[in-house]
Interface confidence: low
């Protein structure tokens, strides 16, 4: 049969907590031994763990409210898939019975004494009441018992005396005009009213009491505008921390216009709310290192070979750079200090060449001297050999690019009687004078 499955079993109360859902079998619910289940009709909550005795229930109330009785408590075999011990099935109850006594004795009723004498009349004039009393001590009740009926009775009495008339206040008169024009100043403005003891006046014979309380009443005036309050500076606050960890910084002190706060049109505080000071950490600031330019590439060589120049044999070359300027624990330069690449050496190799196109015209030289000229060139450019542009290195490192290195000796057919460089020169026209721009401002 499907059951309700819960995620917790509360040992102390025996209740299922955290409903997971219904319509599942006990077997599926109890795949997790921390879970618990309950029949759909609101039956007993059973934990999914192996069966064991529950905690003892609280003791039931004593069977009698006075003198000796007895009381029961129980525990239950709860769990799933088994029993608590031999011959003790799931759901079995085990009982304990003990003697109990809520109250040692049972109450017994007492009896009344005779009525006492009548007390004096409750008033000294006109009509009132008088009372008499009796005691519950013939015999006295036992163990919290009582006597039936009332312990006192009352009846009317007449003093045959005329009562005096006591004074009573007439209605309050109107409020007087206000004693000031704004509130919150040194003297709080107020209004006053008075009343007379005449409704009625106290009798002379027999003498009546005067009216109780004051004949005058004062109250604060309402609806007045507040008195203006001029602002006053509070004390300077603490100096803020130095905002820098090295070199010079600037700290600040603040004060607030709150002693008192300006109110109701009163003037604000004069002067500054802040003041600043220089703070000196006396610590030099760190300077990070910076890479210098790369040095020249070293000669292209191959280990264990005297020279690979003009050969289709890849070699290696390296260049270095230095980390400059690091001071006071600044950051070191990031990156590599050494750069390595693969190369073919064409140093001083005789190579077939071809003439380049004309270069663009160069700058006018000398820029500030007499008769400046500009030049352009055609160069005998070497035709590089068709060696493989990449080489395979150690297993797993893939292909590496190979660079030609060195100054070859290109061979071109003679051009205008030249073998390496043909140059053409022209004069520069309309040349302005060189002047210091700062002097020109004057």
């Amino acid at each position: 049969d499907p059951v309700l499955c819960f995620t917790q079993y509360e040992e102390s109360s025996g209740k299922c907590k955290g409903l997971l859902g219904g319509g599942v079998s006990v077997k599926d619910c109890c795949l997790n031994t921390a879970y618990a289940y309950q029949e759909r009709n609101g039956g007993l909550c059973q934990p999914c763990r192996s069966p064991r005795w529950s905690l003892w229930s609280t003791w039931a109330p004593c069977s009698v409210t006075c003198s000796e009785g007895s009381q029961l408590r129980y525990r239950r075999c709860v769990g799933w898939n088994g029993q608590c011990s031999e011959r003790v099935a799931l759901g079995t109850l085990e009982w304990q019975l003990q003697a109990c006594e809520d109250k040692q004795c049972c109450p017994e009723m007492g009896g009344w004494s005779d009525w006492g004498p009548w007390e004096p009349c409750s008033v000294t004039c006109s009509k009132g009441m008088r009372t008499r009393r009796r005691a519950c001590d013939h015999p006295a009740p036992k163990c919290g018992g009582h006597c039936p009926g009332e312990a006192q009775e009352s009846e009317a009495c007449d003093t045959q005396q005329v009562c005096p008339t006591h004074g009573a206040w007439a209605a309050w008169g109107p409020w007087s005009p206000c004693s000031g024009s704004c509130h919150g100043g040194p003297h709080e403005p107020k209004e006053t009213r008075s009343r007379t003891c005449s409704a009625p006046e106290p009798s002379q014979k027999p003498p009546g009491k005067p009216c109780p309380g004051p004949a005058y009443e004062h109250r604060k005036c309402t609806g007045l505008p507040p008195c203006p309050v001029a602002g006053g500076w509070g004390p300077w606050g603490p100096v803020s921390p130095c905002p820098v960890t090295c070199g010079l910084g600037q700290t600040i002190e603040r004060r607030t216009c709150n002693r008192p706060v300006p109110q109701h049109g009163g003037p604000s505080c004069a002067g500054d709310a802040t003041r600043t000071h220089i703070c000196n950490t006396a610590v030099p600031c760190p300077v990070d290192g910076e890479w210098d330019l790369w040095g020249q590439w070293s000669t292209c060589v191959r280990r264990n070979m005297k020279s690979i120049s003009c050969e289709e044999i890849p070699g290696q070359q390296s260049r270095w750079r230095t980390c400059k300027g690091r001071k006071f624990d600044g950051h070191r330069c990031t990156g590599q200090q050494q750069d390595i690449r693969h190369c073919y050496s064409i140093q001083h190799c005789p190579l077939k060449g071809s003439w380049s196109e004309w270069s663009t015209w160069g700058l006018c030289m000398p820029p500030c001297g007499p008769n400046p000229t500009r030049a352009r060139q055609r160069l005998c450019t070497p035709l590089l050999p068709k060696y493989p542009p990449t080489v395979s290195m150690v297993e797993g490192q893939g292909e590496k690019n190979v660079t030609f290195w060195g100054r070859p000796l290109p061979r071109c057919e003679e051009l205008q009687g030249q073998k390496l460089v043909v140059e053409e020169k022209r004069p520069c026209l309309h040349v302005p004078a060189c002047k210091d721009p700062e002097e020109e401002k004057l």
Partner: nanobody, 119 residues
Framework: EVQLVESGGGLVQAGGSLRLSCAAS????????MAWYRQAPGKQRELVAE???????VYADSVKGRFTISRDDAKNTVTLQMNSLKPEDTAVYYC?????????????WGQGTQVTVSS
């Protein structure tokens, strides 16, 4: 001029958390200190927490260990993370920036954000 805009206020149960944020715009290069102040009804405005340009912090005794102030210079924001909130933390919270000029400082304030902590 510096403009400050607060956000993140609201109603929270005692023991809960809120994160207030203050975005600064305008002439922010000369701001050195940023701070959070608060003002409860009928009381004076009081300092809650302050942070300098290099991250030095100052906290009011009543919030030490519960509130954390931080700044993100890339976004020009200052944040107040408020944990274990108490009913007495109920107030309007104001962002404050202190700008240093050559001849002294200038105070700038946001419009305030309401924080209400219910018991």
């Amino acid at each position: 001029e510096v403009q400050l805009v607060e956000s993140g206020g609201g109603l929270v149960q005692a023991g809960g958390s809120l994160r207030l944020s203050c975005a600064a715009s305008g002439r922010i290069s000369s701001i050195i200190h940023m701070a959070w102040y608060r003002q409860a009804p009928g009381k004076q405005r009081e300092l809650v927490a302050e942070i300098s340009r290099v991250g030095t912090t100052v906290y009011a005794d009543s919030v030490k260990g519960r509130f954390t102030i931080s700044r993100d210079d890339a976004k020009n924001t200052v944040t107040l993370q408020m944990n274990s909130l108490k009913p007495e933390d109920t107030a309007v919270y104001y962002c404050n920036a202190l700008q240093y000029e050559k001849h002294g400082g200038a105070d700038y304030w946001g419009q305030g954000t309401q924080v209400t902590v219910s018991s």
